[in-house]
Protein backbone atom coordinates (compact mmCIF):
# COMPACT_ATOMS: atom_id res chain seq x y z
CA UNK A 1 0.00 0.00 0.00
CA UNK A 2 1.23 3.50 -0.77
CA UNK A 3 -0.11 7.04 -0.57
CA UNK A 4 -1.18 8.58 -3.89
CA UNK A 5 -2.09 11.90 -2.26
CA UNK A 6 -3.37 13.02 1.13
CA UNK A 7 -5.84 10.46 2.52
CA UNK A 8 -5.85 8.47 -0.76
CA UNK A 9 -4.03 5.12 -0.79
CA UNK A 10 -3.37 2.52 -3.48
CA UNK A 11 -3.50 -1.15 -2.52
CA UNK A 12 -1.57 -3.38 -4.92
CA UNK A 13 -3.33 -6.72 -5.36
CA UNK A 14 -2.41 -9.99 -7.03
CA UNK A 15 -5.67 -10.70 -8.85
CA UNK A 16 -6.64 -14.37 -9.20
CA UNK A 17 -9.49 -16.56 -7.93
CA UNK A 18 -9.44 -17.00 -4.12
CA UNK A 19 -6.40 -14.73 -3.74
CA UNK A 20 -5.78 -13.92 -0.06
CA UNK A 21 -5.60 -10.19 -0.72
CA UNK A 22 -3.65 -7.71 1.38
CA UNK A 23 -3.97 -6.86 5.06
CA UNK A 24 -4.11 -3.09 5.46
CA UNK A 25 -3.91 -1.17 8.75
CA UNK A 26 -6.03 2.00 8.88
CA UNK A 27 -5.39 4.59 11.59
CA UNK A 28 -7.94 7.22 12.54
CA UNK A 29 -6.37 10.68 12.37
CA UNK A 30 -7.50 11.90 15.80
CA UNK A 31 -6.17 12.39 19.31
CA UNK A 32 -9.20 10.41 20.53
CA UNK A 33 -8.49 6.87 21.77
CA UNK A 34 -11.85 5.36 22.71
CA UNK A 35 -15.35 5.02 21.25
CA UNK A 36 -14.17 5.12 17.63
CA UNK A 37 -16.11 3.14 15.00
CA UNK A 38 -15.46 2.59 11.30
CA UNK A 39 -17.76 2.50 8.26
CA UNK A 40 -17.18 1.96 4.53
CA UNK A 41 -18.62 4.36 1.94
CA UNK A 42 -22.28 5.33 2.48
CA UNK A 43 -23.12 2.22 4.50
CA UNK A 44 -24.30 2.78 8.06
CA UNK A 45 -23.15 -0.75 8.87
CA UNK A 46 -20.23 -0.61 11.28
CA UNK A 47 -17.15 -2.52 10.17
CA UNK A 48 -15.24 -2.41 13.43
CA UNK A 49 -13.97 -0.22 16.26
CA UNK A 50 -10.76 1.16 17.68
CA UNK A 51 -8.24 3.83 16.67
CA UNK A 52 -6.59 1.37 14.28
CA UNK A 53 -8.39 -1.19 12.15
CA UNK A 54 -6.82 -4.08 10.23
CA UNK A 55 -8.77 -4.93 7.09
CA UNK A 56 -8.37 -7.57 4.40
CA UNK A 57 -8.56 -6.08 0.91
CA UNK A 58 -9.21 -8.61 -1.85
CA UNK A 59 -11.97 -7.25 -4.11
CA UNK A 60 -13.41 -3.93 -5.26
CA UNK A 61 -16.05 -4.22 -2.51
CA UNK A 62 -13.19 -3.65 -0.04
CA UNK A 63 -12.03 -0.44 -1.75
CA UNK A 64 -13.70 2.89 -1.10
CA UNK A 65 -13.88 5.53 1.58
CA UNK A 66 -13.27 4.31 5.12
CA UNK A 67 -14.50 6.76 7.73
CA UNK A 68 -13.86 6.76 11.46
CA UNK A 69 -16.50 8.31 13.73
CA UNK A 70 -17.08 9.07 17.37
CA UNK A 71 -20.51 9.84 18.75
CA UNK A 72 -21.94 10.66 15.33
CA UNK A 73 -19.04 12.98 14.44
CA UNK A 74 -16.72 12.19 11.51
CA UNK A 75 -13.08 12.15 12.60
CA UNK A 76 -11.19 11.28 9.39
CA UNK A 77 -11.37 9.51 6.02
CA UNK A 78 -9.07 7.17 4.07
CA UNK A 79 -9.88 6.39 0.44
CA UNK A 80 -8.53 3.02 -0.75
CA UNK A 81 -8.04 2.37 -4.47
CA UNK A 82 -7.06 -0.98 -6.01
CA UNK A 83 -4.22 -1.60 -8.46
CA UNK A 84 -4.64 -5.06 -10.00
CA UNK A 85 -1.80 -7.33 -11.05
CA UNK A 86 -2.84 -10.37 -13.13
CA UNK A 87 -0.22 -13.00 -14.01
CA UNK A 88 2.48 -10.54 -12.95
CA UNK A 89 1.21 -7.76 -15.25
CA UNK A 90 -0.45 -4.58 -14.00
CA UNK A 91 -3.93 -4.06 -15.45
CA UNK A 92 -4.48 -1.66 -18.37
CA UNK A 93 -8.27 -1.55 -18.41
CA UNK A 94 -8.75 2.23 -18.41
CA UNK A 95 -6.83 3.29 -21.53
CA UNK A 96 -7.11 1.95 -25.05
CA UNK A 97 -4.10 0.41 -26.77
CA UNK A 98 -3.41 2.74 -29.73
CA UNK A 99 -1.25 -0.01 -31.33
CA UNK A 100 0.96 2.60 -33.01
CA UNK A 101 3.89 2.59 -33.44
CA UNK A 102 3.65 -0.81 -31.68
CA UNK A 103 1.30 -2.88 -29.50
CA UNK A 104 0.80 -1.77 -25.90
CA UNK A 105 1.15 1.90 -26.85
CA UNK A 106 -1.21 3.70 -24.48
CA UNK A 107 0.42 7.14 -24.49
CA UNK A 108 1.48 8.94 -27.66
CA UNK A 109 3.55 12.10 -27.63
CA UNK A 110 4.61 14.67 -30.23
CA UNK A 111 6.70 17.84 -30.29
CA UNK A 112 6.43 20.58 -32.94
CA UNK A 113 10.03 21.70 -32.36
CA UNK A 114 13.08 21.34 -30.11
CA UNK A 115 11.98 23.86 -27.44
CA UNK A 116 11.28 21.12 -24.87
CA UNK A 117 7.52 21.55 -25.23
CA UNK A 118 5.54 18.45 -26.15
CA UNK A 119 1.97 17.12 -26.12
CA UNK A 120 0.87 13.62 -25.07
CA UNK A 121 -2.52 12.08 -25.63
CA UNK A 122 -4.40 8.87 -24.85
CA UNK A 123 -7.76 7.25 -25.57
CA UNK A 124 -10.48 5.70 -23.42
CA UNK A 125 -14.07 4.53 -23.85
CA UNK A 126 -14.86 5.57 -20.25
CA UNK A 127 -16.90 8.76 -19.92
CA UNK A 128 -17.47 9.25 -16.17
CA UNK A 129 -15.75 8.88 -12.77
CA UNK A 130 -12.37 9.29 -14.43
CA UNK A 131 -9.38 11.38 -13.33
CA UNK A 132 -5.84 11.71 -14.66
CA UNK A 133 -2.68 13.11 -13.18
CA UNK A 134 0.50 13.59 -15.22
CA UNK A 135 4.11 13.85 -14.07
CA UNK A 136 7.24 14.06 -16.19
CA UNK A 137 11.00 14.38 -15.88
CA UNK A 138 14.15 14.03 -17.95
CA UNK A 139 15.88 10.91 -16.68
CA UNK A 140 14.72 8.88 -13.72
CA UNK A 141 17.71 8.36 -11.39
CA UNK A 142 18.60 12.08 -11.10
CA UNK A 143 15.49 13.59 -12.69
CA UNK A 144 15.46 17.07 -14.24
CA UNK A 145 12.25 19.03 -14.15
CA UNK A 146 9.47 18.92 -16.69
CA UNK A 147 6.24 20.79 -15.92
CA UNK A 148 2.94 19.36 -17.16
CA UNK A 149 -0.45 21.02 -17.13
CA UNK A 150 -3.76 19.35 -16.33
CA UNK A 151 -5.01 16.65 -18.67
CA UNK A 152 -8.08 17.79 -20.59
CA UNK A 153 -10.68 16.11 -22.79
CA UNK A 154 -9.53 17.14 -26.27
CA UNK A 155 -11.80 15.14 -28.60
CA UNK A 156 -14.80 12.79 -28.71
CA UNK A 157 -15.33 10.32 -31.55
CA UNK A 158 -17.92 7.67 -32.34
CA UNK A 159 -16.31 4.31 -33.20
CA UNK A 160 -19.03 1.85 -34.20
CA UNK A 161 -21.25 1.40 -31.15
CA UNK A 162 -18.70 3.00 -28.82
CA UNK A 163 -17.80 6.56 -28.02
CA UNK A 164 -14.08 7.17 -27.73
CA UNK A 165 -12.63 10.00 -25.66
CA UNK A 166 -9.22 11.56 -26.28
CA UNK A 167 -7.40 13.29 -23.43
CA UNK A 168 -4.26 15.35 -23.88
CA UNK A 169 -1.69 17.19 -21.80
CA UNK A 170 1.01 19.72 -22.59
CA UNK A 171 4.41 19.56 -20.90
CA UNK A 172 7.45 21.83 -20.97
CA UNK A 173 10.98 20.93 -20.01
CA UNK A 174 12.05 23.49 -17.39
CA UNK A 175 15.62 24.03 -18.66
CA UNK A 176 15.47 22.93 -22.26
CA UNK A 177 18.52 23.26 -24.49
CA UNK A 178 17.20 22.91 -28.07
CA UNK A 179 20.60 22.49 -29.73
CA UNK A 180 21.98 19.95 -27.22
CA UNK A 181 22.34 16.24 -27.99
CA UNK A 182 19.90 14.36 -25.74
CA UNK A 183 21.46 11.60 -23.64
CA UNK A 184 18.67 11.01 -21.12
CA UNK A 185 15.10 10.37 -22.25
CA UNK A 186 11.99 12.23 -21.15
CA UNK A 187 9.82 10.07 -18.86
CA UNK A 188 6.06 10.66 -18.77
CA UNK A 189 3.91 9.04 -16.08
CA UNK A 190 0.10 9.14 -16.12
CA UNK A 191 -1.93 8.09 -13.07
CA UNK A 192 -5.44 7.05 -14.09
CA UNK A 193 -8.30 6.48 -11.63
CA UNK A 194 -11.68 5.11 -12.69
CA UNK A 195 -14.07 4.80 -9.75
CA UNK A 196 -11.96 2.71 -7.32
CA UNK A 197 -9.48 1.35 -9.87
CA UNK A 198 -5.97 2.81 -10.10
CA UNK A 199 -3.64 2.28 -13.06
CA UNK A 200 -0.45 3.92 -14.22
CA UNK A 201 0.97 4.30 -17.68
CA UNK A 202 4.43 5.42 -18.74
CA UNK A 203 6.23 6.52 -21.88
CA UNK A 204 9.91 7.19 -22.42
CA UNK A 205 11.33 9.06 -25.42
CA UNK A 206 13.83 11.57 -26.74
CA UNK A 207 12.36 14.81 -28.07
CA UNK A 208 14.20 14.18 -31.37
CA UNK A 209 12.18 10.96 -31.85
CA UNK A 210 8.77 12.57 -31.34
CA UNK A 211 9.34 15.62 -33.55
CA UNK A 212 6.53 16.26 -35.99
CA UNK A 213 6.70 19.70 -37.60
CA UNK A 214 3.57 21.68 -38.36
CA UNK A 215 2.72 21.78 -42.09
CA UNK A 216 4.56 24.37 -44.22
CA UNK A 217 2.76 27.74 -44.30
CA UNK A 218 1.89 30.22 -47.07
CA UNK A 219 1.79 27.58 -49.79
CA UNK A 220 1.50 29.46 -53.11
CA UNK A 221 1.51 28.68 -56.84
CA UNK A 222 3.05 30.91 -59.53
CA UNK A 223 2.38 29.80 -63.13
CA UNK A 224 5.44 29.88 -65.40
CA UNK A 225 4.87 31.63 -68.75
CA UNK A 226 4.21 29.45 -71.79
CA UNK A 227 4.37 26.30 -69.69
CA UNK A 228 2.23 23.79 -67.81
CA UNK A 229 4.74 24.12 -65.02
CA UNK A 230 4.18 26.12 -61.85
CA UNK A 231 6.54 27.33 -59.21
CA UNK A 232 5.33 26.18 -55.79
CA UNK A 233 6.63 28.15 -52.81
CA UNK A 234 6.10 27.86 -49.05
CA UNK A 235 7.61 28.92 -45.74
CA UNK A 236 8.77 27.19 -42.60
CA UNK A 237 5.93 26.84 -40.08
CA UNK A 238 5.93 29.49 -37.35
CA UNK A 239 6.24 26.84 -34.66
CA UNK A 240 9.53 25.40 -36.00
CA UNK A 241 12.76 26.01 -34.08
CA UNK A 242 15.03 28.87 -35.09
CA UNK A 243 17.49 29.69 -36.62
CA UNK A 244 16.37 27.73 -39.68
CA UNK A 245 19.98 27.60 -40.87
CA UNK A 246 20.66 25.27 -37.91
CA UNK A 247 17.21 23.67 -37.43
CA UNK A 248 16.66 22.84 -41.09
CA UNK A 249 13.74 21.08 -42.71
CA UNK A 250 13.47 19.02 -45.86
CA UNK A 251 10.27 18.94 -47.92
CA UNK A 252 8.23 16.59 -50.05
CA UNK A 253 6.12 18.10 -52.85
CA UNK A 254 3.35 15.95 -54.28
CA UNK A 255 1.05 16.42 -57.26
CA UNK A 256 -2.11 14.37 -56.78
CA UNK A 257 -4.89 13.97 -59.37
CA UNK A 258 -8.57 14.06 -58.45
CA UNK A 259 -8.68 10.27 -58.42
CA UNK A 260 -6.71 8.52 -55.68
CA UNK A 261 -5.78 5.89 -58.28
CA UNK A 262 -3.89 8.39 -60.40
CA UNK A 263 -0.11 8.28 -60.20
CA UNK A 264 1.37 10.74 -57.71
CA UNK A 265 4.37 12.81 -58.74
CA UNK A 266 6.73 13.48 -55.84
CA UNK A 267 9.72 15.80 -55.54
CA UNK A 268 12.02 16.06 -52.51
CA UNK A 269 13.86 19.30 -51.82
CA UNK A 270 15.65 21.20 -49.08
CA UNK A 271 14.58 24.53 -50.62
CA UNK A 272 11.29 26.34 -49.97
CA UNK A 273 10.21 26.20 -53.58
CA UNK A 274 9.95 23.71 -56.41
CA UNK A 275 8.83 23.58 -60.03
CA UNK A 276 6.19 20.98 -60.90
CA UNK A 277 3.66 20.22 -63.62
CA UNK A 278 0.15 21.14 -62.58
CA UNK A 279 -2.44 18.83 -64.13
CA UNK A 280 -6.08 19.82 -64.49
CA UNK A 281 -8.14 19.12 -61.33
CA UNK A 282 -4.97 18.10 -59.47
CA UNK A 283 -3.77 19.48 -56.16
CA UNK A 284 -0.30 20.23 -54.89
CA UNK A 285 0.70 19.27 -51.37
CA UNK A 286 3.84 19.91 -49.37
CA UNK A 287 4.98 18.40 -46.10
CA UNK A 288 8.07 18.86 -43.93
CA UNK A 289 10.52 16.72 -41.99
CA UNK A 290 13.63 17.44 -39.95
CA UNK A 291 16.44 17.52 -42.48
CA UNK A 292 19.04 15.74 -40.36
CA UNK A 293 16.97 13.29 -38.31
CA UNK A 294 14.26 11.00 -39.66
CA UNK A 295 11.41 11.72 -37.30
CA UNK A 296 7.78 12.09 -38.47
CA UNK A 297 6.69 14.01 -41.51
CA UNK A 298 4.27 16.89 -40.94
CA UNK A 299 0.70 16.75 -42.19
CA UNK A 300 0.26 17.98 -45.76
CA UNK A 301 -0.42 21.59 -46.71
CA UNK A 302 -2.42 21.65 -49.97
CA UNK A 303 -3.59 24.00 -52.73
CA UNK A 304 -5.61 23.21 -55.89
CA UNK A 305 -3.93 23.51 -59.28
CA UNK A 306 -6.75 25.47 -60.91
Amino acid sequence: IWELKKDVYVVELDWYPDAPGEMVVLTCDTPEEDGITWTLDQSSEVLGSGKTLTIQVKEFGDAGQYTCHKGGEVLSHSLLLLHKKEDGIWSTDILKDQKEPKNKTFLRCEAKNYSGRFTCWWLTTISTDLTFSVKSSRGSSDPQGVTCGAATLSAERVRGDNKEYEYSVECQEDSACPAAEESLPIEVMVDAVHKLKYENYTSSFFIRDIIKPDPPKNLQLKPLKNSRQVEVSWEYPDTWSTPHSYFSLTFCVQVQGKSKREKKDRVFTDKTSATVICRKNASISVRAQDRYYSSSWSEWASVPCS
Epitope: T37, E45, Q56, V57, K58, G61, D62
Partner: nanobody
Framework: EMQLVESGGGLVQPGGSLRLSCAAS????????MYWFRQAPGKGHEWVST????????AYADFVKGRFTISRDNAKNTLYLQMNSLKPEDTALYYC????????RGQGTQVTVSS
Protein backbone atom coordinates in the same frame (compact mmCIF):
# COMPACT_ATOMS: atom_id res chain seq x y z
CA GLU B 1 -36.53 -17.64 14.27
CA MET B 2 -32.97 -16.31 13.89
CA GLN B 3 -30.55 -18.02 16.27
CA LEU B 4 -26.77 -18.16 16.89
CA VAL B 5 -25.09 -20.84 19.04
CA GLU B 6 -21.38 -20.64 19.94
CA SER B 7 -19.12 -23.53 20.95
CA GLY B 8 -15.43 -24.43 21.21
CA GLY B 9 -14.42 -22.44 24.28
CA GLY B 10 -12.46 -23.88 27.18
CA LEU B 11 -9.34 -23.63 29.32
CA VAL B 12 -6.06 -23.29 27.45
CA GLN B 13 -2.47 -22.48 28.41
CA PRO B 14 -0.79 -19.25 27.24
CA GLY B 15 0.49 -19.70 23.69
CA GLY B 16 -2.18 -22.29 22.96
CA SER B 17 -4.94 -22.35 20.35
CA LEU B 18 -8.73 -22.71 20.19
CA ARG B 19 -11.25 -22.73 17.38
CA LEU B 20 -14.62 -21.20 18.18
CA SER B 21 -17.73 -22.03 16.14
CA CYS B 22 -20.98 -20.13 15.73
CA ALA B 23 -23.84 -22.11 14.16
CA ALA B 24 -26.57 -19.95 12.61
CA SER B 25 -30.16 -20.83 11.88
CA UNK B 26 -33.13 -18.87 10.52
CA UNK B 27 -30.96 -16.81 8.13
CA UNK B 28 -27.95 -17.21 5.81
CA UNK B 29 -24.62 -15.93 7.17
CA UNK B 30 -23.30 -15.48 3.61
CA UNK B 31 -25.81 -12.67 3.08
CA UNK B 32 -24.77 -10.74 6.18
CA UNK B 33 -21.74 -9.12 7.70
CA MET B 34 -20.94 -11.32 10.72
CA TYR B 35 -19.09 -10.30 13.88
CA TRP B 36 -17.20 -11.75 16.84
CA PHE B 37 -17.21 -9.79 20.09
CA ARG B 38 -15.87 -10.59 23.53
CA GLN B 39 -16.56 -9.47 27.10
CA ALA B 40 -13.92 -9.87 29.79
CA PRO B 41 -14.98 -10.10 33.46
CA GLY B 42 -16.00 -6.67 34.77
CA LYS B 43 -15.45 -5.00 31.37
CA GLY B 44 -17.59 -3.77 28.49
CA HIS B 45 -18.00 -5.75 25.30
CA GLU B 46 -15.18 -5.45 22.78
CA TRP B 47 -15.24 -5.99 19.02
CA VAL B 48 -12.84 -8.69 17.79
CA SER B 49 -13.44 -9.29 14.08
CA THR B 50 -15.83 -8.94 11.11
CA UNK B 51 -16.34 -10.98 7.95
CA UNK B 52 -18.14 -9.31 5.06
CA UNK B 53 -20.45 -10.64 2.36
CA UNK B 54 -19.15 -11.40 -1.15
CA UNK B 55 -15.60 -12.73 -1.13
CA UNK B 56 -15.64 -12.77 2.67
CA UNK B 57 -13.09 -10.05 3.29
CA UNK B 58 -12.25 -9.55 6.94
CA ALA B 59 -11.42 -6.90 9.53
CA TYR B 60 -9.71 -7.21 12.92
CA ALA B 61 -9.26 -5.20 16.09
CA ASP B 62 -5.77 -3.86 16.84
CA PHE B 63 -5.17 -6.29 19.74
CA VAL B 64 -5.58 -9.29 17.39
CA LYS B 65 -2.21 -8.52 15.67
CA GLY B 66 -2.42 -11.48 13.27
CA ARG B 67 -3.20 -14.05 15.97
CA PHE B 68 -6.89 -14.65 15.13
CA THR B 69 -8.59 -15.60 11.85
CA ILE B 70 -12.30 -15.22 11.15
CA SER B 71 -13.86 -17.48 8.49
CA ARG B 72 -17.17 -19.02 7.48
CA ASP B 73 -18.53 -22.18 5.91
CA ASN B 74 -21.58 -21.17 3.87
CA ALA B 75 -22.71 -24.78 3.35
CA LYS B 76 -22.76 -25.37 7.12
CA ASN B 77 -24.01 -21.83 7.81
CA THR B 78 -21.31 -21.59 10.47
CA LEU B 79 -18.93 -18.80 11.48
CA TYR B 80 -15.48 -19.57 12.99
CA LEU B 81 -12.78 -17.81 14.96
CA GLN B 82 -9.39 -19.53 14.96
CA MET B 83 -7.40 -18.18 17.91
CA ASN B 84 -3.63 -18.79 18.11
CA SER B 85 -0.88 -17.53 20.46
CA LEU B 86 -3.48 -16.96 23.17
CA LYS B 87 -2.61 -14.66 26.10
CA PRO B 88 -4.12 -14.39 29.60
CA GLU B 89 -5.68 -11.04 28.56
CA ASP B 90 -7.71 -12.92 25.92
CA THR B 91 -9.74 -14.49 28.74
CA ALA B 92 -13.37 -13.50 28.06
CA LEU B 93 -16.82 -14.63 26.98
CA TYR B 94 -16.76 -14.74 23.16
CA TYR B 95 -19.96 -14.35 21.18
CA CYS B 96 -20.98 -13.94 17.56
CA UNK B 97 -23.54 -11.44 16.23
CA UNK B 98 -25.39 -10.77 13.01
CA UNK B 99 -25.14 -6.99 13.38
CA UNK B 100 -23.04 -4.41 15.19
CA UNK B 101 -25.77 -3.63 17.72
CA UNK B 102 -26.02 -7.31 18.64
CA UNK B 103 -29.78 -7.53 18.11
CA UNK B 104 -29.17 -11.11 16.91
CA ARG B 105 -26.39 -12.64 19.01
CA GLY B 106 -25.51 -15.87 20.73
CA GLN B 107 -25.15 -16.64 24.43
CA GLY B 108 -21.38 -16.90 24.09
CA THR B 109 -18.64 -19.45 24.84
CA GLN B 110 -16.13 -18.93 27.66
CA VAL B 111 -12.40 -18.82 26.86
CA THR B 112 -9.95 -18.96 29.78
CA VAL B 113 -6.21 -18.59 29.18
CA SER B 114 -4.24 -19.59 32.26
CA SER B 115 -1.26 -21.70 33.26
Amino acid sequence: EMQLVESGGGLVQPGGSLRLSCAASGFSISNNWMYWFRQAPGKGHEWVSTIKTGAGSTAYADFVKGRFTISRDNAKNTLYLQMNSLKPEDTALYYCARDWAGTVRGQGTQVTVSS
